[in-house]
Interface confidence: medium
């Protein structure tokens, strides 16, 4: 790597993937193994992120960009740049302090992450329940009773049994 000749700041010409080495008369030196510089003119290289444990490598570190991690199966990313991995739950569950717990009656979760949320209240829109909700699925709203033609009726399956007490004590 040639010495930079900038009169302003001799380091400004050092490209990404290098650092301006004060110990070597401000020569642009390549980043050492397991380090990177994503912008030019840097006086040090940053240590590459290591994807260990529940993290797995999504993109390897290069001299110009940091490694990117995601989560091993059974976990999903949380936080900027996947700074944390949070446990997946099954559909119909949510993650609590005590691990995955079934959704309380009247709520559902159709994903492996996030929270149980209340079933849609069909009556607020003047509709009736066409299909009852479950822990995994929201209710399906149908036309209001007044919209049904004479003799027709909305099919309402029996309500699911109340879940055992998962609400806070």
């Amino acid at each position: 790597f040639e010495r930079t000749r900038s009169l302003q700041d001799p380091c400004s010409n050092c490209p990404a993937g290098t650092f301006c080495d004060n110990n070597r008369n401000q020569i642009c030196s390549p980043c050492p193994p397991n380090s990177f510089s994503s912008a030019g003119g840097q006086r040090t290289c940053d240590i590459c992120r290591q994807c260990k444990g529940v993290f797995r490598t999504r993109k390897e570190c290069s001299s110009t960009s940091n490694a990117e991690c995601d989560c091993t199966p059974g976990f999903h990313c949380l936080g900027a740049g996947c700074s944390m991995c949070e446990q997946d739950c099954k559909q119909g569950q949510e993650l609590t302090k005590k691990g995955c717990k079934d959704c309380c009656f009247g709520t559902f979760n159709d994903q492996k992450r996030g929270i149980c949320r209340p079933w849609t209240n069909c009556s607020l829109d003047g509709k009736s329940v066409l299909v009852n909700g479950t822990k995994e699925r929201d209710v399906v709203c149908g036309p209001s009773p007044a919209d049904l033609s004479p003799g027709a009726s909305s099919v309402t399956p029996p309500a699911p049994a109340r879940e055992p007490g998962h609400s806070p004590q």
């Epitope: 949380l78 949070e86 609590t96 302090k97 994903q111 996030g114 929270i115 949320r117 609400s167 806070p168």
Partner: antibody
Framework: QMQLVQSGAEVKKPGASVKVSCKAS????????MYWVRQAPGQGLEWMGI????????NYAQKFQGRVTMTRDTSTSTVYMELSSLRSEDTAVYYC????????????????WGQGTMVTVSS | SSELTQDPAVSVASGQTVRITCQGD??????AGWYQQKPGQAPVLVIF???NRPSGIPDRFSGSSSGNTASLTITGAQAEDEADYYC???????????FGTGTKVTVL
């Protein structure tokens, strides 16, 4: 990291409505549940409600049911909070906020906040 | 009225440790988030989940949880830690969120 930019301060008369906007810097904002929180002068934080921009799901605090409406415009990555029938007690800074992890974290933790919009209700 | 209760105010000598608590039935099931707010500024998340710190938050901030109580501890408090601190979590129905009443921390 996503940033949230809110609309400017408003002065309203009692009985009027106010609509505050919150624009996200990322087009992936449909991955993020958006929360609205307010703070009256000298008072604590108060949760108003939540909207999921991906499916328009809303969940409002009991106190604001019937007076608050949260909407979104995915084409501009913007969410809105409209509060009607304003009274003097609604004078507050209104914040939109979100969790950078995306989704509706079980923690309800909010690590991205707008700068706040001061709404003054005065006759 | 808030479902999460905090002590209104607490003082700590610079360099000492202070513990702020947040009580509520929903905390038996859900973790709390903790926020620092300085005058005229938006709140800043300092702890969430079991004991997770967002990037940029000093490691003198830590969180813990037992029963219906969540705690935020500042070990070696600094002058810049003087602020209002709020907890938040789901409410006891699990369907809404709620903030604690807030604790004013003064560093002497």
């Amino acid at each position: 990291q996503m940033q949230l930019v809110q609309s400017g301060a408003e002065v309203k008369k009692p009985g009027a409505s106010v609509k505050v906007s919150c624009k996200a810097s990322e087009h992936t904002f449909t991955s993020y549940y958006m929360y609205w929180v307010r703070q009256a002068p000298g008072q604590g934080l108060e949760w108003m409600g939540i909207i999921n921009p991906s499916d328009d799901y809303t969940n409002y605090a009991q106190k604001f049911q019937g007076r608050v409406t949260m909407t979104r415009d995915t084409s501009t990555s913007t969410v809105y909070m409209e509060l009607s029938s304003l009274r003097s007690e609604d004078t507050a800074v209104y914040y939109c906020a979100s969790f950078n992890g995306g989704g509706n974290s079980v923690f309800g933790a909010l690590d991205i906040w707008g700068q706040g919009t001061m709404v003054t209700v005065s006759s | 009225s808030s479902e999460l209760t905090q002590d209104p105010a607490v003082s700590v000598a610079s360099g000492q440790t202070v513990r702020i608590t947040c009580q509520g039935d929903s905390l038996r099931r859900y973790y709390a988030g903790w926020y620092q707010q300085k005058p005229g500024q938006a709140p800043v998340l300092v702890i969430f989940g079991k004991n997770n710190r967002p990037s940029g938050i000093p490691d003198r901030f830590s969180g813990s949880s037992s029963g219906n109580t969540a705690s935020l501890t500042i070990t070696g408090a600094q002058a810049e830690d003087e602020a209002d601190y709020y907890c938040n979590s789901r409410d006891s129905s699990g369907n809404h969120y709620v903030f604690g009443t807030g604790t004013k921390v003064t560093v002497l």
